[in-house]
Interface confidence: medium
């Protein structure tokens, strides 16, 4: 049995268990998947579609399917369906939408639900270069090699919330091996991590995650990390950059950083001391009031959040602490010659609402090339369409991203740092112990 | 006249490969997912494989996995299969069919059958 | 193990109803599946019989008599196919299919005989 553990990956392999509803006659059904989208070869899973009570039926289709995946009469009280997947094997792996039937007729598609399966390779390993015990400031390398050559490779740090670096050669070239330099090391990027490998033409199919790898740094300062409880819409801290490669120049973004967090540890302890006063106030002003007044301090004003269901049953898989605390780093490594320039497309999940700061790369040739034809990786972000570059370019770094041991296969990138911006949408209803308050784009790579 | 012709049947040797041709008519044949079919003489029927109207999925029958390639040329409303590695198993009618596409898919267009045997 | 199991034959008089089954197993649940039946007789083209997923939700193949209807039995994991008023002309080999797990599979075929 594989351990568990978490992390998210940057495509947004669900986009979260829960997905917006649409206003009109038949809204879009909800689609997710429990115990995860992320599911070992062998294990169950369960996918659900919650539609509305007027539900007749729900549909089950997966995508370049010809014929419905599965249908199922809804259980009470009809607004979902339960779709069991007693053992997750290839078959299983790829991109599902459900419908429902009322008796107007069939609903909208919901959202994509893209389900993956690991352990459909055997398992990379993954290696520290020079040596797992690395000093602060120092630069190391962690190695994911497969036995077999593969053309993508997936770093995933326990406990965090993306994949560090996910390296895709393209043009058919497949590689044994994949480097994910970081460098200048920090206490940040102690930890354990794991590497995935995958073929392109099989986007929903993992490797077995490697051996863990524990990842020390000494002579550090005391670590950084923000609290777990953090909020997820205040300042990222140093976490939320990206692995620093060998020899770049990061414009002094660390100790920049430094000053962020201390400037918001200032401000969060000058916050909480006034909440702690006013609330004092509040207390000893109540003392003098009377019952009747005091109840009416109770009452939910109008437009006030309801408060949320207790059914935690369908929450989502994601703790509110892994959420928040990944080196947010994802690149899609095209295969080029040393002298071809490069280009670099930022992009954004059109429903990208975390405000965290993730750095998504994508990295083209300059040079005319004929690309090939391929459904877009749920494991390289290329499905994130918008071309909107935030104004944050003071905190674009040079990286480096070497897909293979062969000195042409090295990609220079550009990666632009944006933030990505809460969406002026309303919030969606509450539903069954989701936190409109935090809606994540990513999936929670659970292995189970 | 909606009509499906197989054709390329005919005796190989085990390890050997043979290539069949499906002509579609009557209808639009790149809106369809297209099948193959086949059925041992006095057996059930089996499904070898099908390819989507985009020429981006093919799906295959575990026991033809890796040996039977379907391709189709929407241009000239062709469909085949490439047998390689033919086992004396393969030895069947092989019949080319076409999902209705509806949400009830089913098989609605048959061709006639091509027979395949395979022998030493 | 096949997914379907069909009986090899049933014999029925001319006039009769005849009851085909098609049992599905590895666990997968005949709720939540269309089955498809195919009739082929003897010497032709298989055709589609009847596409059935509810009593709602049917439909029967071209030029198949309005006399053939679908059900099914979620208690013993079953599809039925029932041919009533049998005919001399329905004397055929009806095979039950689903699709399941990127694959279309087919049962065995029951060989239906009109005595």
């Known amino acids: 049995m594989i351990p568990t553990f978490t992390a998210l990956l940057c495509l947004g392999l669900s986009l979260g268990p829960r997905t917006h509803m649409q206003a009109g006659p038949l809204p879009k059904p909800t689609l997710w998947a429990e115990p995860g989208s992320v599911i070992s070869w062998g294990n169950s899973v369960t996918i659900w579609c919650q539609g509305t009570l007027e539900a007749r039926e729900y549909r089950l289709d997966k995508e370049e399917s010809p014929a419905p995946w599965d249908r199922q009469n809804p259980l009470e009280p009809k607004n979902k369906a339960r779709f069991s997947i007693p053992s997750m094997t290839e078959d299983y792996a790829g991109r599902y939408r459900c419908y429902y039937r009322s008796p107007v007729g069939w609903s909208q598609p919901s959202d994509p639900l893209e389900l993956v399966m690991t352990g459909a390779y055997s398992k990379p390993t993954l290696s520290a270069l020079p040596s797992p015990l690395v000093t602060s400031g120092k630069s190391v390398t962690l190695l994911c090699q497969s036995r077999s050559p593969m053309d993508t490779f997936l770093l995933i740090k326990e406990r965090a919330a993306h994949p560090l670096l996910h390296l895709r050669s393209e043009h058919g070239a497949q590689q044994h091996q994949a480097e994910f330099p970081m460098s200048p090391v920090t206490s940040v990027h102690g930890g354990t991590y794991r590497c995935f490998s995958s073929h392109g033409f099989s986007h929903y199919l993992l490797s077995h995650p490697s051996d863990p790898l524990e990842l020390i740094v000494s002579g550090s300062l005391e670590d950084p990390r923000p609290s777990p409880t953090r909020s997820v819409s205040t300042a990222a801290g140093p976490e939320d950059q990206p692995l620093m490669p060998t020899g770049s120049v990061p414009h002094s973004g660390l100790r920049r950083h430094w000053e962020v967090l201390i400037g918001v540890l200032v401000v969060s302890i000058l916050l909480l001391s006034l909440l702690l006063f006013l609330l004092l106030q509040h207390w000893r002003q109540g003392k003098h009031r009377t019952l009747a007044q005091r109840q009416a301090d109770f009452q939910r004003p109008p437009g006030a959040a309801e408060p949320e269901p207790k059914d935690g049953g369908l929450q989502r898989r994601s703790s509110p602490a892994a959420d928040v605390q990944g080196e947010n780093f994802c690149a899609a490594v095209k295969n080029t010659q040393p002298e071809d320039g490069v280009e670099m497309d930022t992009r954004q999940s059109p429903h990208d609402e975390d405000p965290q700061a993730v750095t998504y790369a994508k990295v083209k040739h300059s040079r005319p090339r004929r690309e090939m034809a391929s459904p877009p990786s749920p494991l390289s972000g290329e499905f994130l369409d918008t071309k909107d570059r935030q104004a944050e370019e003071d905190r674009q770094m040079d990286t480096e991203a070497a897909a293979s041991e062969a000195p042409q296969d090295v990609t220079y990138a550009q990666l632009h740092s944006f933030t990505l911006r809460q969406k002026a949408t309303e919030p969606p209803p509450s539903q069954e112990g989701a936190s409109p308050a935090e809606p994540s784009v990513y999936a929670t790579l659970a292995i189970h | 006249e909606v009509k499906l012709v197989e054709s390329g049947g005919g005796l190989v040797k085990p390890g050997g490969s043979l290539k069949l041709s499906c002509a579609a008519s009557?209808?639009?044949?790149?809106?369809?997912?297209m099948n193959w079919v086949r059925q041992a003489p006095g057996k059930r029927l089996e499904w070898v494989g099908d390819?989507?109207?985009?020429?981006?999925?093919?799906n295959y029958s575990p026991s033809v996995k890796g040996r039977f390639t379907i391709s189709r040329d929407n241009a000239k409303s062709i469909l085949y299969l490439q047998m390689n590695s033919v086992k004396s198993e393969d030895t069947a009618t092989y019949y080319c069919v076409r999902n209705h596409g509806s949400r009830y898919a089913y098989f609605d267009v048959w061709g006639q059958g091509i027979q395949v045997t395979v022998s030493s | 193990q096949s997914i379907l199991t069909q009986p090899p034959s049933i014999s029925e008089s001319l006039g009769s109803t005849a009851r085909l089954t098609c049992t599905l197993n590895n666990g997968i649940s005949v709720g939540g599946k269309n089955i498809y039946w195919y009739q082929q007789m003897a010497g032709s083209v298989p055709r589609l019989f009847l596409y059935y997923y509810s009593d709602s939700d049917k439909e029967l193949g071209p030029g198949v008599p309005n006399r053939d209807s679908g059900s099914k039995d979620t208690s013993k994991k079953a599809a039925n196919l029932q041919i009533s008023e049998l005919q001399v002309e329905d004397e055929a080999v009806c095979f039950c299919?689903?699709?399941?797990?990127?694959?279309?599979?087919f049962g065995s075929g029951t060989k239906v005989t009109v005595l």
């Open positions: 390819i989507n109207k985009d020429v981006t999925t093919t």
């Open positions: 009557g209808f639009m044949f790149s809106s369809y997912w």
């Open positions: 299919s689903i699709y399941e797990s990127n694959t279309w599979v």
